[in-house]
């Protein structure tokens, strides 16, 4: 039994986090800042044609653990970094893709060539 | 000597099309990605997208899908851009420009060909 | 698509003088930015590579340093070949863009 003057509907968690969106805006968002009670995140994937195309948005807290995990993909590439240290946090994260591994090679000459991206995290 | 050689200068009336072609001469083509960029009169340059020089799977940046397309004649060592239903603002000078694969600066490019709308 | 701002638009300097043009990307692009040299009627030079990388064959009067959103160009002894417009381009991510230019012209 509650105690008097406690609710017993639910509280919303407030959406205290703002974050930068590309690709990855929902609806409601205002110049491309997305809120979220999780954590702000960039990715960047290879798309069908081996571009890379880099996302950012918002994760909410549920479920965010894992998605920040990056846990690879099998013949996928790609690379996610999550932050909640300040709003629009995720500007200033620079994910990279993961080097090419043997069996990515089938493709032909044009996976072939070697990644000269320096991994820095200043 | 590595060299992209563009056909020559085209005029074209507003919903016709054109076809650039880019050579490759002095390495193999399959072996680097082959980018177009776009240059409007008196502008900055904007990249259209790139085609996959060894799979023939292009890519193209938003403002450049529909009316756009490249392709390849691996035999003849060429890349081709056509635009289709040109239009007033598609006057420009267009450069192809070669990528070593999976980096995306440009460190050889076409000599230009510069297409112009005739009204 | 992300944007690259670069200024000044134009620089006006004599032989001998040191030249330094900035671009500000709006997300942090690592090393990923390029530097381009196009003369009039030409096509683009690829000058500077990973921010700081020269090209082959490019004079060692040019250099690129940065990282992040902050990049920068720098001619330490202006010539009179390099009238030019100089263009800084990010490669982190699709679509690849430009900054603007900046045109360099020579007293």
């Known amino acids: 039994k509650k105690e008097d003057g406690e609710s017993t509907a639910p509280t919303a968690r407030p959406k205290v986090l703002r974050c930068k969106c590309h690709h990855h805006c929902p609806e409601d968002s205002v110049n491309n800042i997305c809120s979220t009670d999780g954590y702000c995140f960039t990715m960047i994937e290879e798309d069908d044609s081996g571009t890379p195309v880099v996302t950012s948005g918002c994760l909410g807290l549920e479920g965010s653990d894992f998605q920040c995990r990056d846990t690879p993909i099998p013949h996928q590439r790609r690379s996610i970094e999550c932050c909640t240290e300040r709003n629009e946090c995720n500007k200033d994260l620079h994910p990279t893709l993961p080097p090419l591994k043997d069996r990515d090679f089938v493709d032909g000459p044009i996976h072939h060539k070697h990644h000269h991206h320096h991994h820095h995290h200043h | 000597q590595i060299q992209l050689v563009q056909s020559g200068p085209e005029l074209k009336k507003p919903g016709e099309t054109v076809k650039i072609s880019c050579k490759a001469s002095g390495y193999t083509l399959t072996t680097y990605g082959m980018n177009w960029v776009k240059q409007a009169p008196g502008k900055g340059l904007k990249w259209m997208g790139w085609?996959?020089?060894?799979?023939?799977?292009?890519a193209y940046a938003d403002d450049f899908k529909g009316r756009f397309a490249f392709s390849l004649e691996t035999s003849a060592s060429t890349a081709y851009l056509q635009i289709n239903n040109f239009k007033n603002e598609d006057t420009a000078t267009y450069f192809c420009?070669?990528?070593?694969?999976?980096?995306?600066?440009?460190?050889?490019w076409g000599t230009g060909t510069t297409v112009t709308v005739s009204s | 698509s992300f944007v690259m701002t670069q200024t000044p638009k134009f620089l006006l300097v004599s032989a001998g003088d040191r030249v330094t043009i900035t671009c500000k990307a709006s997300q942090n692009m690592g090393h990923n930015v390029a530097w381009y040299q196009q003369k009039p009627g030409q096509s683009p030079k690829l000058l500077i590579y990973y921010a700081s990388n020269r090209y082959t064959g490019v004079p060692d009067r040019f250099t690129g340093s940065g990282y992040g959103t902050d990049f920068t160009f720098t001619i330490s002894t202006v010539q009179a070949e390099d009238l030019a417009v100089y263009f800084c381009?990010?490669?982190?991510?699709?679509?690849?863009?430009f900054g603007s230019g900046t045109k360099l012209e020579i007293k």
């Open positions: 420009a070669r990528s070593e694969l999976r980096n995306w600066y440009f460190d050889v």
């Open positions: 381009q990010q490669d982190y991510s699709s679509p690849f863009t």
């Open positions: 085609i996959n020089t060894y799979s023939g799977v292009p």
